[in-house]
């Protein structure tokens, strides 16, 4: 990550509020804890595929299997959540595809929040057929481990039948679960055999047991709730972007920087420049000029378009993104060819001091 001195006449303070541009959103794959997940890298003509998670190289291990264009995660856990990328390296270029993995169960027990289908779980028996409690929909009870982001709503269900109609009560960690045990209490919908906790917090973690009983017997089922805590994080930039580019003198070129951020990102496009004939300041750091930044008068800040380029435009272009929490930056090189040479997409160019304009 480069260090630099900003050229004095390009300081951006105070910043203007960013425009409401759309921050790129990758495709999201959702898995429940314990499930296996398989994702195919959606890139064509891939000679070699490499994988990253949250910008860090991903290799095979006892739960992660990489076969050709497929990534398999066995027995997913919330720690597998994150921003994944597969990069296809070809003979002339490379391309990256991004996707999110979210291992969670926001509305639990295999049901939607509205309980629209719950009525059929309330089974009425012929009054002559006495029967101990039994589960009527075990599919909705298969997931025992529920990892839920803080502040989400959790629902546990134990659809049951019996004659006479059983009653249902809930235990937390083996003890009677009382309303005063959590701020905001909880809801029990007996007709839907459900327990609902809104806006969960870390203290809600634990084992929740439904006990369903009538005079002929008792059955129970236990769910484990884990509350995944959230905090704001620094921006993440899509690997491989901006990409190196080349064009002829007088041509046009575009650099793209894709940003994933959960706090307002400020995007800057920066280039090495000279000041008083020098590329470096007294501190030895290069002078850099802000070409574009997110703000009121700036259109899509994720794209830097250069028109009618000259040889002086050649060099390194840095996409620098910051939010209140931290920064990220990546760079690409622009090669400007004489008019007679045809432009083409370049391979990655290794930066060297001699390459500066």
């Amino acid at each position: 990550r480069p260090s630099f001195s900003l050229v004095e006449d390009t300081t951006l303070e105070p910043e203007e509020p960013p425009t409401k541009y759309q921050i790129s959103q990758p495709e999201v794959y959702v898995a429940a804890p314990g499930e296996s997940l398989e994702v195919r890298c959606l890139l064509k003509d891939a000679a070699v595929i490499s994988w990253t998670k949250d910008g860090v190289h991903l290799g095979p291990n006892n739960r992660t299997v990489l076969i050709g264009e497929y990534l398999q995660i066995k027995g997913a856990t919330p720690r597998d959540s994150g921003l994944y990328a597969c990069t296809a390296s070809r003979t002339v270029d490379s391309e990256t595809w991004y996707f999110m993995v979210n291992v969670t169960d926001a509305i639990s027990s295999g049901d939607d929040e509205d309980d629209t289908d719950g009525a059929e779980d309330f089974v009425s028996e012929n009054s002559n057929n006495k029967r101990a409690p039994y589960w009527t929909n075990t599919e909705k009870m298969e997931k025992r481990l529920h990892a839920v982001p803080a502040a989400n709503t959790v629902k546990f269900r134990c659809p049951a039948g019996g004659n006479p109609m059983p009653t249902m009560r809930w235990l937390k960690n083996g003890k009677e679960f009382k309303q005063e045990h959590r701020i905001g209490g909880y809801k029990v919908r007996n007709q839907h055999w459900s327990l609902i906790m809104e806006s969960v917090v870390p203290s809600d973690k634990g084992n929740y047991t439904c006990v369903v009983e009538n005079e002929y017997g008792s059955i129970n089922h236990t769910y484990h709730l884990d509350v995944v805590e959230r905090s704001p994080h620094r921006p993440i930039l899509q690997a491989g972007l901006p990409a190196n580019a080349s064009t002829v003198v007088g041509g046009d070129v575009e650099f793209v920087c894709k940003v994933y951020s959960d706090a307002q990102p400020h995007i800057q496009w920066i280039k090495h420049v000279e000041k008083n004939g020098s590329k470096y300041g007294p501190d030895g750091l290069p002078y850099l000029k802000v070409l574009k930044h997110s703000g009121i008068n700036s259109s899509n800040a994720e794209v830097l378009a250069l028109f009618n380029v000259t040889e002086a435009d050649a060099g390194e272009y840095i996409c620098k993104v910051s939010n209140y929490i931290g920064q990220a930056n990546q760079s690409a090189w622009l090669t400007v060819l004489p008019k007679q040479q045809a432009p083409g997409r370049e391979k990655e160019i290794t930066a060297s001091p001699d390459y500066l304009e």
Epitope: Q264, S322, I325
Partner: antibody
């Protein structure tokens, strides 16, 4: 665990210099801004500025530009706030914060003749 | 600079009350809005809500945030004894990252 530990309280005379510190631990110090916030006695919070330790990128509130200097030494995971010439009006509690979520305990600076 | 104006500057409430504090920005600070902090005497501020409505880890669910554009609200659904403190909003969209002047919540 993740924490920021600030240097102890200081009592100084007007015109003296001072450098207070904020040491981070339990996380990657270079990956988060360190913000400095002033709170004068009985008053509210004022954002002074911030530094990104990885590359020493620094930004100041116009109200504090030229009045203080923010720096960092990433090799020892420490950020600094310094004054070259203190004034009585600098008397305040100074907090450092990692982003928004982790705050130091504060350093009380008293400037009095 | 973007000014953040909080109201009221102080309020008296009882345990169990629903408390609402508002913060108005001098200009639109969408799309990623404001933070809310709680501060008790002699203590550092504590982050409650980030980006207007996201509950910070470990913060009780009785705290919630809402709003967009220029108007933001912190709500405490049922005031608890430990909630008597001063609350600050902050915008983190544009330098300088300004705070509101604070709202002191006192016992009635």
């Amino acid at each position: 665990q993740v924490q920021l530990v600030q240097s102890g309280a200081e009592v100084k005379k007007p015109g003296e210099s001072l450098k207070i510190s904020c040491k981070g631990s339990g996380y990657s110090f270079t990956n988060y801004y360190i913000h400095w916030v002033r709170q004068m006695p009985g008053k509210g919070l004022e954002w002074m500025g911030a530094i990104y330790p990885d590359n020493s990128d620094t930004t100041y509130s116009p109200s504090f530009q030229g009045q203080v200097t923010i720096s960092a030494d990433k090799s020892i995971s420490t950020a600094y706030l310094q004054w070259s010439s203190l004034k009585a009006s600098d008397t305040a509690m100074y907090y450092c914060a990692r982003g928004a979520d982790i705050w130091g305990q504060g350093t009380l600076v008293t400037v009095s003749s | 600079d973007i000014q953040m104006t909080q109201s009221p500057s102080s309020l008296s409430a009882s345990v169990g009350d629903r408390v609402t504090i508002t913060c108005r920005a001098s200009q639109d600070i969408d799309p990623y809005l404001s933070n809310w902090y709680q501060q008790k005497p002699g203590k550092a501020p504590k982050l409650l809500i980030y980006d207007a409505s996201n509950l910070q880890s470990g913060v009780p669910s009785r705290f919630s945030g809402s709003g967009s554009g220029t108007d933001f609200t912190l709500t405490i659904s049922s005031l608890q004894p430990e909630d008597f403190a001063t609350y600050y909003c902050q915008q983190t969209t544009s330098h300088p990252y300004t705070f509101g002047q604070g709202t002191k919540v006192e016992i009635k």
